[in-house]
Interface confidence: low
């Protein structure tokens, strides 16, 4: 059995045995999605590991359960993000909004969709069911982690950019008008994707296909694993954690807190001043009348903003904690109990990682009744079964009766909910 040997894998068998062999070594476990190496001496025994070290002790029930969860997330996430992207691309009524939020939503839907399409099938096949040999070659190994990381960065940065866009639209609507033109927004989103690709470039040099069989010859010993020194791998992981989690989390936490506070003030003003609220920065403000139902929408908006932050932390924190375990837990601290914990923790973190890509359409899009209506209409167009079941629209609402002395007023409130 192995002391320090993981995964992007799945759980070990339930743990009466305190020395269960670590899943695919720390090898695959720390790896997928993300990566890590057999801790400690891995670099010194790169071609000497026994082939069965690469196995993952996952009972069939766990595999089936994980597969079922993944498939459910895959279907819901793929449908949600595809319809979102399709809706945003095709519906003129959304594109005509003065707000450029739909560009950000479309970019987020694309990064989520790519994450699900590119990462989940490979992980399901090569990290949950067939742990070795790695089936996609050296280029496939490097490409997989490059694309996966690029999509991860893109998702995180898109979430952050959405918060920036909403912050400007709600707290600085006048600045927003000049700062957030369509061309600038397109350039900004292009920059996000370029930055994501550049940030993921280290994966092309970090990962690679290696043969971990005893003599380095058996095809069954092929694994997709870090090929560089462990210390460098740890630096890559930490930079990744900072850029794809800590930085975006700080951005969305701070900005969404500011936005939520602003919306709370708007709700209070609406109640105190006969449903009239003031929107704007310190140098320019404007007033608007808000119908009673809109107050509820603003309250709902506050809850949504909080949900966005909570969802980001809940879905991404465990995933990054798991990867940081590799950086900060030494060889000697990898006890058999910790391995057992890690196996189950791995499964939970990866499921949550994909939950993030699945719920983003719900969090960012379906909370808007206007978008939801168009979304369901699009789904009805795309899916005849759905069309037959929906005899009448599931949602209807009156047009916003928002009056203002400024053209930005309706934008500032209608789009507050993402």
């Amino acid at each position: 059995m192995r002391l320090n040997s993981s995964a992007p894998g799945t759980p070990g068998t339930p743990a009466a045995d305190p020395f269960q062999r670590a899943q695919a070594g720390l090898e695959e476990a720390l790896l997928a999605p993300g990566f890590g190496n057999a801790s400690g001496n891995a670099s010194e025994r790169v071609l000497a590991a026994p082939s069965s070290e690469l196995d993952v002790n996952t009972d069939i029930y766990s595999k089936v359960l994980v597969t079922a969860v993944y498939l459910a997330l895959f279907v819901v996430g793929t449908v949600g993000n595809t319809v979102t992207a399709f809706t945003l691309a095709r519906k003129k009524s959304l594109q005509s909004l003065q707000s450029t939020v739909h560009y950000h939503l479309g970019s987020l839907a694309l990064s989520d969709l790519l994450t699900l399409l590119l990462a989940m099938p490979v992980e399901l096949y090569n990290f949950i069911w067939v742990h070795h040999p790695w089936a996609f070659g050296d280029a496939g190994c490097r490409g997989y982690y490059f694309l996966r990381d690029a999509c991860t960065y893109a998702t995180a940065l898109n979430v952050a950019s959405l918060s920036v866009e909403r912050y400007l639209a709600i707290c600085h609507p006048f600045k927003a008008k000049t700062l957030m033109s369509r061309s600038r927004t397109k350039k900004f989103i292009s920059a996000i994707w370029l930055a994501s690709a550049l940030l993921a470039v280290p994966m092309l040099f970090t990962m690679g296909e290696q043969n971990r069989s005893a003599d380095g010859q058996h095809a069954g010993g092929l694994v997709c694993t870090p090929t560089i020194h462990t210390a460098t791998v740890k630096v890559v992981i930490q930079v990744n954690t900072f850029m794809s989690f800590i930085f975006p989390m700080v951005v969305i936490s701070v900005l969404n807190t500011i936005i939520a506070n602003k919306l709370t003030v708007m709700v209070r003003q609406a109640a105190e001043q006969g449903q009239v609220c003031t929107v704007g920065g310190e140098h320019s403000t404007f007033s608007m009348a808000i119908e009673p139902g809109r107050v509820q929408a603003l309250r709902h908006g506050v809850r949504v903003l909080r949900a966005v932050v909570i969802a980001f932390v809940v879905c991404w924190l465990p995933y990054h904690v798991r990867r940081l375990m590799f950086c900060y837990i030494s060889d000697e601290q990898w006890t058999p109990f910790l391995y057992d914990f890690y196996h189950y923790f791995y499964m939970v973190t990866n499921a949550l990682f994909y939950v993030s890509s699945t719920i983003n359409p719900i969090l960012y899009n379906l909370v808007s009744a206007n978008f939801r209506h168009i979304f369901l209409a699009t789904l009805a167009c795309l899916c005849p079964v759905w069309r037959r079941r929906r005899k009448r629209p599931a949602f209807s609402r009156k047009a916003d009766s928002v009056s203002s002395n400024h053209t930005l007023s309706s934008n500032a409130t209608r789009e507050t909910l993402y």
């Epitope: 020395f19 670590a22 069965s52």
Partner: antibody, heavy 123, light 107 residues
Framework: AVTLDESGGGLQTPGRALSLVCKAS????????MIWVRQTPGKGLEWVAS????????YYAPAVKGRATISRDNGQSTVRLQLNNLRAEDTATYFC????????????????WGHGTEVIVSS | ALTQPSSVSANLGGTVKITCSGS??????YGWYQQKAPGSAPVTVI????NRPSNIPSRFSGSASGSTATLTITGVRAEDEAVYFC???????????FGAGTTLTVL
Amino acid sequence: AVTLDESGGGLQTPGRALSLVCKASGFTFSSFNMIWVRQTPGKGLEWVASICTGGSYTYYAPAVKGRATISRDNGQSTVRLQLNNLRAEDTATYFCAKSVDGVGWHAGQIDAWGHGTEVIVSS
Amino acid sequence: ALTQPSSVSANLGGTVKITCSGSGSSWHGYGWYQQKAPGSAPVTVIYDNTNRPSNIPSRFSGSASGSTATLTITGVRAEDEAVYFCGGYDSSTYAGIFGAGTTLTVL
């Protein structure tokens, strides 16, 4: 070539303590777990204890648990087995063995053996 | 414990299989060790189910499935006559374990 040289065996008195030392060479000692195995006269092999690369984690057979202590000195490339409260059934040839890597530790993970040192526990 | 046949025989140049089963598991890995004389140093012929040390001839091979491991020697030679022990891990006692040994006689 990998060599493992055991020492410290000989005639021992019941109830006393025994200390066996294994000197390793021919490989990067600190990268491999080490194992002690014994063989009683005319009998089979019996796994006794294992120690991980850094020395913090140790594993013992039920027959010696509480009486045995395995330790290592990576600087000196030595591994030591101390066995207290010796019994007649501890009479055996004790082999020092090298694990296949830094993660294997049990009886299916040995790739090199020492020549052994004979221990006789008798009053 | 691990169970092995106490003895097997094989014709010179023939093939022999020695099995080992019990409370071990292929997941944790089996090893096969050759001992020419009692008290002499064992030699590892297979470790971790299927892996053969570089100094061991290719006629020795190992396989494992579930709780059973098999050592196969093809083209048996006179010098292969020895006692073969299998080693593994007992998940009920969390300890390393060996089989009682199988004596191979070459005819």
